[in-house]
Interface confidence: medium
């Protein structure tokens, strides 16, 4: 006997559906109506035939009361080929829900997204997370998707993007976006970062995560941020192969005074990089290849310094920097 495709936990909180049959019984997903977190994985299916069974142009207001009653706050949809028209139909209906976080992963979006009708209301998401989503429209995908969202988006995460650079002239500003996570786009690089950080479109960014994005030097990142007018409070550059030295011909970059937390862990550093901000509240240099304790003149003025997991540190040695937060135990790096 084949297992049930959908499982709802005992608290009616989380519901996970894995539709792996070639012709799945989608009605099984109805048992998720009472859940707060819903995950639907479509087993790589092409949902094109779905368009014949649903009227994507129907007025979603007819479903408003039903959708408003749903408890769902977090929705994950994964592993499918989805016509843009179907995605738009779903977004129009979900606009009446209390959905706060939408995650799309391992999806191939085919066709173009139509413009938002005048009478339609956008989806009031707090968080949008995309992982390995490809769009037929190339660089304009963010602008197309953005028009279906209300302007209150706070968190945007884009990983394994097929086109991490956006068509900046088409993108509207994200006035409320405080956290942007572009991690796990190893082909991005510093030039790609400049293209992705559309100038003046992210005025409220406080947290920027760039883990595993092909960044080369902190100075190069500084230049990209300065060009875009992005001034994060917290910057995560961990899991990049960073060079400690700066190209002598490159112009010096002044970091924004807003930056107070910098994560340079797992960056393969053999020495403290040049060109760091002069003052930081938090600096994480853990799990690098530092063979000696950094000298005070190599470091920014920093309140909390983490150096755990570097070769020079042996459990039980004295803390190498006043105010540092080393545990004395070498972590599994």
């Amino acid at each position: 006997t084949t297992p049930e495709p959908c499982e709802l936990d005992d608290e009616d909180f989380r519901c996970v559906c894995n539709f792996s049959e070639p012709q799945p019984d989608w009605s099984e997903a109805f048992q998720c109506v009472s859940a707060v977190e819903v995950e639907i994985h479509a087993g790589g299916l092409n949902l094109e035939p779905f368009l014949k069974r649903v009227d994507a142009d129907a007025d979603p207001r007819q479903y408003a009361d039903t959708v408003k009653a749903l408890r769902v706050r977090r929705l994950t949809v994964g592993a499918a080929q989805v016509p843009a028209q179907l995605l738009v139909g779903a977004l129009r209906v979900l606009a009446y829900s209390r959905l706060k976080e939408l995650t799309l992963e391992d999806l191939k979006i085919t066709g173009t997204m139509p413009p938002l009708p005048l009478e339609a209301t956008g989806l009031a998401l707090s968080s949008l997370r995309l992982r390995n989503v490809s769009w037929a429209t190339g660089r304009s995908w963010l602008a197309e998707l953005q028009q279906w969202l209300k302007p209150g988006l706070k968190v945007l995460s884009i990983a394994q993007a097929h086109s991490p650079a956006f068509s900046c002239e088409q993108v509207r500003a994200f006035p409320a976006l405080t956290s942007l996570d572009l991690s796990d786009n190893p082909g991005l690089g510093e030039r790609g970062l400049m293209a992705a950080l559309c100038p003046h479109k992210f005025p409220a960014i406080q947290n920027l995560a760039l883990r595993n994005t092909g960044m080369e030097t902190p100075t190069g990142v500084c230049a990209a941020l300065a060009a875009a007018g992005v001034q994060p409070h917290s910057l995560d550059l961990s899991h990049n192969s960073l060079r400690a030295t700066v190209n002598p011909s490159a112009p010096r970059c002044m970091w924004s005074s807003a930056l107070n937390s910098l994560n340079l862990s797992f960056a393969g550093l053999e020495q403290v990089p040049k060109g760091l901000p002069a003052k930081l509240r938090v600096l994480d240099l853990s799990c690098n290849r530092l063979n000696r304790a950094p000298q005070p003149d190599e470091l920014p003025e920093v309140d909390n310094l983490t150096l755990d997991g570097n070769p020079f540190l042996v459990p039980g040695t004295a803390l190498p920097h006043e105010g540092s937060m080393n545990s004395g135990v070498v972590p599994a790096c």
Partner: nanobody
Framework: QVQLQESGGGLVQSGGSLRLSCAVS????????MGWYRQAPGKGRELVAE??????NYADSVLGRFTISRDNAKNTVYLQMNSLKPEDTAVYYC?????????????????WGQGTQVTVSS
């Protein structure tokens, strides 16, 4: 740990007023929505009022009688309840949607208070 602390509930005569407060404490990064829900005996939890990005939303049954407001500096949301009716009797819960805390700024988080009892006698 992020916590919500409600206060202001109690016993009031029909037609009277109460003001509920809900303070968010802990390592908050960014509050998106704050709202009030209620649960009457034997019934499900229902939305009373919420403050979302740039807009307010009320249940039809409280429109014109209840007002939700927020003090961003104090991370506190209020519910001013006027012209109270016996059918408003319930436990009132505060709810906050946070996009991240200082230790995890890239996650959405939902937090509920313990609830405060409101009883309206006829």
């Amino acid at each position: 740990q992020v916590q919500l602390q409600e206060s202001g509930g109690g016993l009031v005569q029909s037609g009277g007023s109460l003001r509920l407060s809900c303070a968010v404490s802990g390592s908050i990064f960014s509050i998106v929505d704050m709202g009030w829900y209620r649960q009457a005996p034997g019934k499900g939890r229902e939305l009373v009022a919420e403050l979302s990005y740039g807009s307010t939303n009320y249940a039809d049954s409280v429109l014109g009688r209840f007002t939700i407001s927020r003090d961003n500096a104090k991370n506190t949301v209020y519910l001013q309840m006027n012209s109270l009716k016996p059918e408003d009797t319930a436990v009132y819960y505060c709810n906050a949607d946070l996009t991240g805390t200082s230790w995890s700024p890239y996650r959405y988080l939902e937090v509920w208070g313990q609830g405060t009892q409101v009883t309206v006698s006829s």
